[in-house]
């Protein structure tokens, strides 16, 4: 297992939201991406394929999500002060073989200016 | 270690229906694509079909769309062939195979089906 | 659907040979960096059992003297010094599309 902080910008504001970006190498075809809060799974979303090349796709802790050929965002809505917390992607590797575990992470710091109903 | 064990295999006549299972143990069955491929007496190895983790995709080979159903208990670790109209060509060991994300890693012993009146 | 072909059907071989056998793709199996192209063995009365992934990855336990090779639509599996037990059928399989198609097979007898 490799651990490690993000080398990119994990957290991204809009709307009282925030997206948090989980990257993989391009070479990745199925894999296993977890989004954990502390030691607990928030949201997952693994990408698997069939002896047909079929991708599947599934959830098992639903949360918004969205796919790209490098990376998985996952997105969290109604950000109060509570979600300040380290995030880490925890990335297992099905394919191309060897399986691997990668987890990277960082610190989500909230500020008043990204709360989504602040009080005037 | 994993184990795939079919049983259901048999005489049937030409027309007719039957049902072929395949226990799974010694991995977590709901984390793979699992597969039915087929071997008729003295000839090579054909795709039957494949489902994925959770059922909700299945796909077929041309030879058994819309005759053949495949599907799965993941409570029971069970993968199911349903096969129905069945014709003499369909004569053959059935194998379950699981999709090991890039190839087919682990294979039952297999069962027989033979299509006869 | 992608066929797939295999030369020889069969062949008699003896121990401490060098077999090849060959496999050829009607379209070529290369996707990114991977050719999805696949070696199972079976012999006589038993399950077929992975050898190759990948075109030339071998699988855990799979002794050295299997080698598989080749990229786009040509393949070849080598057994380096054959040995008894290693006679049964070969065959090659694609995993590129819907259907996965296998080879005809390669059966190695003894000579």
């Known amino acids: 297992e490799i651990n490690g902080s993000a080398n990119y910008e994990m957290f991204i504001f809009h709307n009282g939201g925030v997206q948090i970006l989980c990257k993989y190498p391009d070479i990745v075809q199925q894999f296993k991406m977890q989004l954990l809060k502390g030691g607990q799974i928030l949201c997952d979303l693994t990408k698997t394929k069939g002896s047909g090349n079929t991708v599947s796709i599934k959830s098992l802790k639903f949360c918004h999500s969205q796919l790209s050929n490098n990376s998985v965002s996952f997105f969290l809505y109604n950000l109060d002060h509570s979600h300040a917390n380290y995030y880490f992607c925890n990335l297992s590797i099905f394919d191309p073989p060897p399986f691997k575990v990668t987890l990277t992470g960082g610190y989500l710091h909230i500020y008043e200016s990204q709360l989504c109903c602040q009080l005037k | 270690e994993v184990q795939l064990v079919e049983s259901g295999g048999g005489l049937v006549k030409p027309g007719g229906s039957l049902k072929l299972s395949c226990a799974a143990s010694?991995?977590?069955?709901?984390?793979?694509?699992m597969d039915w491929v087929r071997q008729a007496p003295g000839k090579g190895l054909e795709w039957v079909g494949n489902?994925?983790?959770?059922?909700?995709?299945?796909e077929y080979s041309p030879f058994v769309k819309g005759r053949f159903t495949i599907s799965r208990d993941n409570v029971k670790n069970t993968l199911y062939l349903q096969m129905n109209s069945v014709k003499s060509e369909d004569t053959a060991t059935y194998y379950c195979?699981?999709?090991?994300?890039?190839?087919?890693?682990?294979w039952g012993q297999g069962t027989l089906v033979t299509v006869s009146s | 659907d992608i066929v797939m072909t295999q030369s020889p059907s069969s062949l008699a071989v003896s121990a401490g040979d060098r077999v090849t056998i060959n496999c050829k793709s009607s379209?070529?199996?290369?996707?990114?960096?991977?050719?999805?192209l696949t070696w199972y063995q079976q012999k006589t009365g038993q399950a077929p059992k992975l050898l190759i992934f990948?075109?030339?990855t071998r699988h855990t336990g799979v002794p050295d003297r299997f080698m598989g090779s080749g990229s786009g639509t040509d393949f070849t599996l080598t057994i380096n010094s054959f040995q008894t037990e290693d006679l049964g059928d070969y065959y090659c399989?694609?995993?590129?599309?819907?259907?996965?198609?296998f080879g005809p097979g390669t059966k190695l007898e003894l000579r």
């Open positions: 195979s699981r999709w090991g994300r890039f190839a087919f890693d682990s």
């Open positions: 010694g991995f977590t069955f709901s984390d793979y694509w």
């Open positions: 489902i994925d983790e959770d059922g909700s995709i299945a």
């Open positions: 379209q070529s199996l290369l996707s990114g960096s991977f050719n999805y």
């Open positions: 990948y075109a030339s």
């Open positions: 399989h694609h995993h590129y599309n819907a259907p996965p198609t």
